[in-house]
Interface confidence: medium
């Protein structure tokens, strides 16, 4: 299944020119004095896409990104000169690259930038209602951005703003060595991960942060960070990268005597995404590039989609793996990784685990501790020396749902849309690459609903020149995809059913869950429409069963796949 879908050819391959010709892409090609359109914030309510870039923040209309407003937020000449004298590149580094863009409250956003190696944050007024049409920088109130935005524009911040508190995974120093997960803003003292302890974080690169409830009690809410980092010595022979998921309790206020203003509930586990190799050695996709959470009916259990690439320069490959939160929780409730000294191997901890179990949030649900400051000393001591779990998190079905090798590109971004089709629900993945293309892929169950087959529906070139796709957002309301790169921002529809041809058979063979034959054309499928009048078969793509003679119009022999 993953093997036979390994290098499946797209049913539809559209060059940038073809996208243009068929009016399927709108591109904002950037400003001459800006670049790096990497930080996205989607606001479906206001129908805006906020984009942070070099010296600018944009507010694009989701209907059509041609309609936009912009805020210019450069650094002062003094700051730029200081940065230049520090030996930094005036164009690529000595500017304000926006790294954090989060909704602060009903009327304001919170934004942070590198500030020419002097991180800075401020608030942006967006008004109560879309019709207010407000988009302005609160330039009377700037805040120190240390621990919020990195100093270096080459680094990313994973951020999340909830209840007036900013969680961020970033580098907190000029040299880009002190990586930490912070909580700032709000009324409490800032909290961070333990400093200078490679067991906690070992030169990480943060991807994203998400709030996921643990139970029906909000006190148990956890913030999960996804990142990749260097494997700790003894965990792997030689230098290697590991993909990680880290957890923190939202109500963690640090310890009382030890781990003061440090997380007491931080735990991390390795995310495995691998395939068995021909020689019995697994091929690992360890370089986590992006994560997308697909919400389910149960807010406690979203499906985690991860995009990974290989670390090896010899073997270039990409994969998508899916994880369930129940598997993640099982690992965090499993054995802790332990070693007796720097020259020892990591083993599962066999001794007594103190109570309450490290990593458990203080709440009425799981025990009688109201605050992390009340935790017993042995819990804090154990937490400090055992931040990692021994067991890794394996993907659903123990394997990737999609891999791509022997191609000249690698995956960089992913968003997923859950689509209702005639024969069930399908997850459609939109995968961005480092050459400016987007792959549209549908997971179709084979014999069982657990065994998935990947169908590569479309490969679309969305930027004129090859460029790494560094941000992606999907608007279910607008049925549009928004893509960011160094060069600019692109917008494209999630579906273009008319492109699948003029016959029922072609429409059916496309196996695109967005599309069905309506009797006269291939058009958007809506589950509310009368089933009898719509021909669609995603699972099998069988036109003979689903297309009446009238629908096929004797044109079965005409069906073709565009390449």
């Amino acid at each position: 299944n993953y093997a036979n879908g390994k290098n499946n050819v797209p049913r539809l391959k559209l060059s940038y020119k073809e996208m243009l010709e068929s009016n399927n892409v709108i591109t904002f090609n950037g400003l001459a004095n800006s670049s790096s359109y990497h930080t996205f914030l989607l606001d479906e309510e206001r129908s805006r896409l906020y984009v942070g870039a070099k010296d600018h923040i944009f507010s694009f209309n989701l209907v059509n990104i041609k309609d936009f407003q912009k805020i210019v937020w450069p650094v002062s000449y003094t700051r730029r000169d200081e940065c230049k004298w520090a030996g930094k590149d005036i164009l690529k580094e000595c500017a304000n690259f926006i790294k954090v863009l989060e909704a602060y409250n009903q009327t304001h956003l919170y934004a942070c930038g590198t500030g020419a190696f002097h991180p800075i944050c401020t608030y942006i007024e967006v008004g109560h209602h879309p019709e207010d049409n407000i988009f302005k920088l609160q330039d009377s109130h700037f805040e120190n951005g240390r621990g919020k935005s990195p100093y270096d524009p080459k680094l990313l911040t994973a951020s999340l703003l909830i209840d007036g508190e900013l969680y961020s995974g970033t580098a907190a120093d000029f040299m880009g060595r002190d990586f930490a997960i912070f909580r700032t803003l709000g009324h409490h003292h800032p909290i961070r991960t333990e400093q200078h302890d490679s067991r906690w974080l070992n030169d990480p690169r943060f991807i994203s942060a998400h709030l996921i409830p643990e139970s029906d009690n909000p006190e148990d809410d956890k913030v999960y960070f996804f990142f990749r980092e260097n494997a700790i010595d003894g965990e792997h022979s030689g230098k290697a990268t590991h993909a990680r998921i880290g957890q923190i309790c939202k109500n963690d206020f640090g310890g009382h005597r030890s781990l003061v203003n440090k997380w007491t509930t931080f735990l991390k586990a390795r995310l495995i995404c691998s395939v068995p190799g021909p020689n019995g050695i697994d091929t690992h996709f360890d370089e986590l590039q992006d994560v997308f959470l697909m919400n389910s009916k149960d807010p406690k259990n979203p499906i985690v989609y991860g995009v990974f690439t290989t670390s090896s320069n010899i073997f270039k490959g990409s994969a998508v793996c899916m994880y369930s939160m129940s598997d993640v929780r099982r690992v965090f409730l499993g054995p802790y990784a332990h070693r007796d000294g720097p020259n020892y191997q990591w083993v599962p901890y066999q001794g007594r685990v103190p109570y309450p179990r490290p990593g458990t949030c203080p709440s009425k649900t799981f025990g009688g501790f109201d605050s992390t400051k009340d935790l017993p000393d042995d819990v804090i001591t154990f937490a400090r020396s055992h931040p990692a779990m021994y067991n890794p998190v394996f993907p659903i079905n123990n394997r990737p749902i999609m891999i791509k090798t022997d191609v000249n590109y690698q995956f960089t971004q992913i968003v997923v849309d859950r689509v209702d089709a005639e024969d069930g629900q399908y997850d459609v993945m939109f995968i961005g690459t480092d050459v400016g293309t987007v792959l549209k892929v549908v997971s179709v169950p084979k014999e069982t609903w657990h065994d998935l087959e990947e169908i590569l529906l479309e490969e679309m070139t969305v930027f004129r020149e090859p460029t790494t796709i560094s941000a992606m957002e999907l608007s279910t309301k607008q049925q549009q995809l928004y893509i960011g790169s160094t060069a600019g921002v692109a917008q494209l529809p999630l579906h273009r059913c008319d492109i699948y041809g003029k016959a029922c058979a072609e429409c059916c063979l496309a196996r695109d869950p967005y599309c069905a034959w309506d009797g006269s054309s291939c058009s958007r499928y809506f589950p509310t429409a009368k089933a009898r009048t719509r021909a669609q078969d995603i699972r099998n793509g069988d036109p003979l069963t689903h297309c009446s003679d009238g629908g096929i119009e004797g044109r079965m022999d005409h069906h073709h796949h565009h390449h």
């Epitope: 243009l20 090609n29 400003l31 309609d67």
Partner: antibody, heavy 120, light 112 residues
């Protein structure tokens, strides 16, 4: 409907100045890069100057230091301030919208033009 | 002296096919897309072809563009009297700090 309407042309002596305006309507003016293109009598098209939606400006070598392009997004108007005019600046001046959203990188709409005559 | 080279004139009779060439260099046509503009007598130029060979909506399919290497051409099939106009090719030029350059223009005459 997209419309571009130039004004401000006329007869001017060498060394003199003129300010051309281009009133835009029918599209979100602030979202587009705009250009001035000229055509000397009986001759071909020559690009003169451009201004991006970010306010960045570009000039042909022949007018650099003498002409200044600007825009007032609140008035949906493009300007060309022409100083130290020479006889060779005599031409019909067109204001044109550059459609670089779809990366067509083409001037997709043009005004009807305004004639500038530099003569003593 | 125009950066892009076009023949000054071309002619054809109604119904005929006419081709106009445009020659440039590696810094313009060779590395950027080509646009064609039509200028009817006494009017402003109008975009005819963009991105080498794409037509904006409203332009008849009698007009087609092509590009090969550092040269481009515009073909008009089924020539009509209303096609009598000046035709200009244009491209962006990397060596001139990414500014647009035009051809000298070709005057198309429809005979008879």
């Amino acid at each position: 409907e997209v419309q571009l309407l130039e004004s401000g042309g006329g007869l001017v002596q060498p060394g003199g100045s003129l300010r051309l305006s281009c009133a835009a309507s029918g599209f979100t003016f602030y979202s587009y890069a705009m250009s001035w293109v000229r055509q000397a009598p009986g001759k071909g098209l020559e690009w003169v100057s451009a201004i991006g939606y970010g306010g960045d400006t570009y000039y042909a070598d022949s007018v650099k230091g003498r002409f200044t392009i600007s825009r007032d997004n609140s008035k949906n108007t493009l300007y060309l301030q022409m100083n130290s005019l020479r006889a060779e600046d005599t031409a019909v001046y067109y204001c044109a919208r550059r459609d670089d959203y779809t990366s067509r990188d083409a001037f997709d709409y043009w005004g009807q033009g305004t004639l500038v005559t530099v003569s003593s | 002296q125009s950066v892009l080279t076009q023949p000054p004139s071309a002619s054809g009779t109604p119904g005929q096919r006419v081709t106009i060439s445009c020659s440039g260099s590696s810094s313009n046509i060779g590395s950027n897309t080509v646009n064609w503009y039509q200028q009817l007598p006494g009017t402003a130029p109008k975009l005819l072809i963009y991105y080498d060979d794409l037509r904006p909506s409203g332009v008849p399919d009698r007009f087609s563009g092509s590009k090969s290497g550092t040269s481009a051409s515009l073909a008009i099939s089924g020539l009509q009297s209303e096609d009598e106009a000046d035709y200009y090719c244009a491209a962006w030029d990397d060596s001139l700090n990414d500014i647009p350059v035009f051809g000298g223009g070709t005057k198309l005459t429809v005979l008879g």
